[in-house]
Each structure stands twice: as structure tokens, then as C-alpha cells.
């Protein structure tokens, strides 16, 4: 799997999409997990509804929400109020039994807010009380890592 890069601005919402073959993954729940190191496990962040027929319902865990268009074959993850600590490697997964197939490897990059030098009164930051439905989603910038780019750079 190539790694797709999604860039979002700090404080805003980032939408990550993971397309898949709807027939191949028919009846399978999906999950979004965070990769812990190059060889480490992928730690589950949020998964779709327990009942596959209700996969389109938005499920959330903290500031992360997931919804699955099972007929169209697109899993969508929304990271709300993006923070620097959200940056890192993730996976979209298709679950079957205790196994998980990787649908897409994702690198989330968090960009500094270009407006953060302005008076805070000029800024709009989604409040905790605001719903995912109301949150503004910044159109994400995505690209695949180029040949030779190292997803996990060696640590010194």
C-alpha cells in the first residue's frame, strides 16, 4: 500500500476518505486506527456501527468521527479541531472476524493556522458543544508519498 498524505490546518476539521471495493468488503465493518511506529500495532481509534446495515450512521470517539457509504464504497473519517498531536500515520481498515485488511495507509499532516497571528476574536474555532454535522470541514490536501520517501524516518 502506498501512503496517502492528508494535510489539514490546526484548529480546523480534516476529512480523510478511503475508497474501497464495495462488493469485496460487503458486510464488513470498518475502522480507523493509528499506527504506533513502523512495526508497531495499529491502535483502534474509532469503528463503524456494530450493525453493518447501519454503517452510514456517524460514530465518534472524542474529536474523531467515522461514517461508511457501504454501497458507494467510501469510508470517511473526520478529525475535528485538528491539533499538532493528531499528526502521524493511520490506517483505514476492513474488519472480518479478528482480522483486519488495510484499505488505505494515511499520513496526517497538521499545518500551522496561517491566521493565528490575528486577534483571536477574528478566529472561529469549533467549540466542544458544536456537533460534527455543524463543524466546517477544510477540504483536505492529499497526495501519495513519492517513491523513495520514508514513511517512518529513522529515529536518532
Amino acid at each position: 500500500h502506498n501512503t496517502t498524505v492528508f494535510q489539514g490546518v490546526e484548529g480546523q476539521s480534516l476529512q480523510v476518505s478511503c475508497p474501497y471495493d464495495s462488493m469485496k468488503h460487503w458486510g464488513r465493518r470498518k475502522a480507523w486506527c493509528r499506527q504506533l511506529g513502523e512495526k508497531g500495532p495499529c491502535q483502534r481509534v474509532v469503528s463503524t456501527h456494530n450493525l453493518w446495515l447501519l454503517s452510514f450512521l456517524r460514530r465518534r470517539n472524542g474529536s474523531t468521527a467515522i461514517t461508511d457509504d457501504t454501497l458507494g464504497g467510501t469510508l470517511t473519517i473526520t478529525l475535528r479541531n485538528l491539533q499538532p498531536h493528531d499528526a502521524g500515520f493511520y490506517q483505514c481498515q476492513s474488519l472480518h472476524g479478528s482480522e483486519a485488511d488495510t484499505l488505505r495507509k494515511v499520513l496526517v499532516e497538521v499545518l500551522a493556522d496561517p491566521l493565528d497571528h490575528r486577534d483571536a476574536g477574528d478566529l472561529w474555532v469549533p467549540g466542544e458543544s458544536e456537533s460534527f454535522e455543524d463543524a466546517h470541514v477544510e477540504h483536505s490536501i492529499s497526495r501519495s508519498l513519492l517513491e523513495g520517501e520514508i514513511p517512518f524516518p529513522p529515529t536518532s
Epitope: W26, N50, L51, W52, L53, F56, R58, R60, T70, L71
Partner: antibody, heavy 126, light 106 residues
């Protein structure tokens, strides 16, 4: 008139099988998720399972206590949903209802059940 | 699994009274909650869906509110025909009902 009518209930011995039918009329049956519920005498409501619309290739889901024993199916040409109950237990004794899931669009529905049948009594006893 | 705690289990009120029933979820269920009315010997009837939406044809004296873990169902002015048992139903986790609230007339 939108209507659901259940049939097939009765007295059955533990370990035996029974098939319930739910005949729909007054709406496009294939477009809706159909569900089965039950209510033991004097008790509350329990979801049994449901079967997806034609768009979802009649995919089924069940509550844990009936998984592997009960099977939901549908026949679009007859507008009938079925509940096949095998290896019946005394605790399966209840009034069984079929119900229609509320539909928002071709793909989206909500598990709010807006049309119900009158129910059919199933008694499992030796 | 999510537990739905409905209270009270029964209540008695006079015609014209405002009646309130609560449903508490063991964890956040967003607004994934419906309310039903069931009269003795009859099938349940959908009254409120998605926590606060009134089902078509249901009298406006019925209403629902809440989100997260705490939900409220209200009959603004109790009528004799409202004698029934009322159930909440969540669909955030699976499909689970509360224990029911039996409403009687004083």
C-alpha cells in the same frame, strides 16, 4: 393502506422449528429494511433482527441470543418477510412482531420502526 | 453493550397534566434514540425518532428532547387515550429498548 400482517405462530415443543411470515401491503416492499421484534408475556420489547432492502442485497443482522438459530429472509415477489426459528427454547416464548424501518432515501434509513404488524404468539412448551 | 434506564417505571397523572419520562443511556448515544407508545394488546407505535422529531400524524402534545446520555419524553397535556406503556429505543450500539414506563390516569 400501509399494512403488515404476521402469521405462523402457535404452540411448539422445545428443540423444534417454526416459520413466521409477515405479509406487507400498501408500499414498495423491496425498498425497506424489515425487522422482527418480540415481547415475552408481561415483559418489554426485544429486537430480534432485520433484513436489508433490495439495495443492500437482503443482508441480515441478528441479536446475539438468536444468532445461528433464527434466519430472516424475504421474498420481494410476494412482499413477505420470514422468520425461520430453529432449536426453539422455552425462553423464546413471546409475541413476535414484524416492523418496517423508516426510510430517508434509496440508501439511507433509520432504525425507527414506523409500521408494525399486529403480532403473532409463539409458545414454546413441552 | 449500552444499557437504557427508563424512569419512572410507572406513573399516575390527571387528565391535562404534563407528563415527563426520562431515558438514560449508559454511554453517549448522540441523538440515536426513538420513543414508542404501546397500548395493551396492541403493537408499538412510533411517536418520536432521532430524539426529537415528531413522527407524521402524531399529536403535537408529544415531544422529545436530549442528546448524549440523557433524554426526555413529554406529554404536554395528558389525554385519556394516552394510557399506555412508553418505551425508548437506542440504535447507537445495537437496537436496545428501555424497560418501559406505564402511564395511568388518576
Amino acid at each position: 393502506e400501509v399494512q403488515l400482517v404476521e402469521s405462523g405462530g402457535g404452540l411448539v415443543q422445545p428443540g423444534r422449528s417454526l416459520r413466521l411470515s409477515c405479509t406487507a401491503s400498501g408500499f414498495t416492499f423491496d425498498d425497506y429494511t424489515m425487522s422482527w421484534f418480540r415481547q415475552a408475556p408481561g415483559k418489554g420489547l426485544e429486537w430480534v433482527g432485520f433484513i436489508g432492502s433490495k439495495a443492500y442485497s437482503a443482508t441480515t443482522e441478528y441479536t446475539a441470543s438468536v444468532k445461528g438459530r433464527f434466519t430472516i429472509s424475504r421474498d420481494g415477489s410476494k412482499s413477505i418477510a420470514y422468520l425461520q426459528m430453529n432449536s426453539l427454547k422455552t425462553e423464546d416464548t413471546a409475541v413476535y412482531y414484524c416492523a418496517r424501518g423508516k426510510r430517508y432515501s434509496y440508501t439511507y434509513w433509520t432504525p425507527a420502526f414506523d409500521v408494525w404488524g399486529q403480532g403473532t404468539m409463539v409458545t414454546v412448551s413441552s | 453493550d449500552i444499557q437504557m434506564t427508563q424512569s419512572p417505571s410507572s406513573l399516575s397523572a390527571s387528565v391535562g397534566d404534563r407528563v415527563t419520562i426520562t431515558c438514560q443511556a449508559s454511554q453517549d448515544i448522540t441523538n440515536y434514540l426513538n420513543w414508542y407508545q404501546q397500548k395493551p394488546g396492541k403493537a408499538p407505535k412510533l411517536l418520536i425518532y432521532d430524539a426529537s422529531n415528531l413522527e407524521t400524524g402524531v399529536p403535537s402534545r408529544f415531544s422529545g428532547s436530549g442528546s448524549g446520555t440523557d433524554f426526555t419524553f413529554t406529554i404536554s397535556s395528558l389525554q385519556p387515550e394516552d394510557i399506555a406503556t412508553y418505551y425508548c429505543q437506542e440504535y447507537d450500539s445495537y437496537i436496545t429498548f428501555g424497560g418501559g414506563t406505564k402511564v395511568e390516569i388518576k
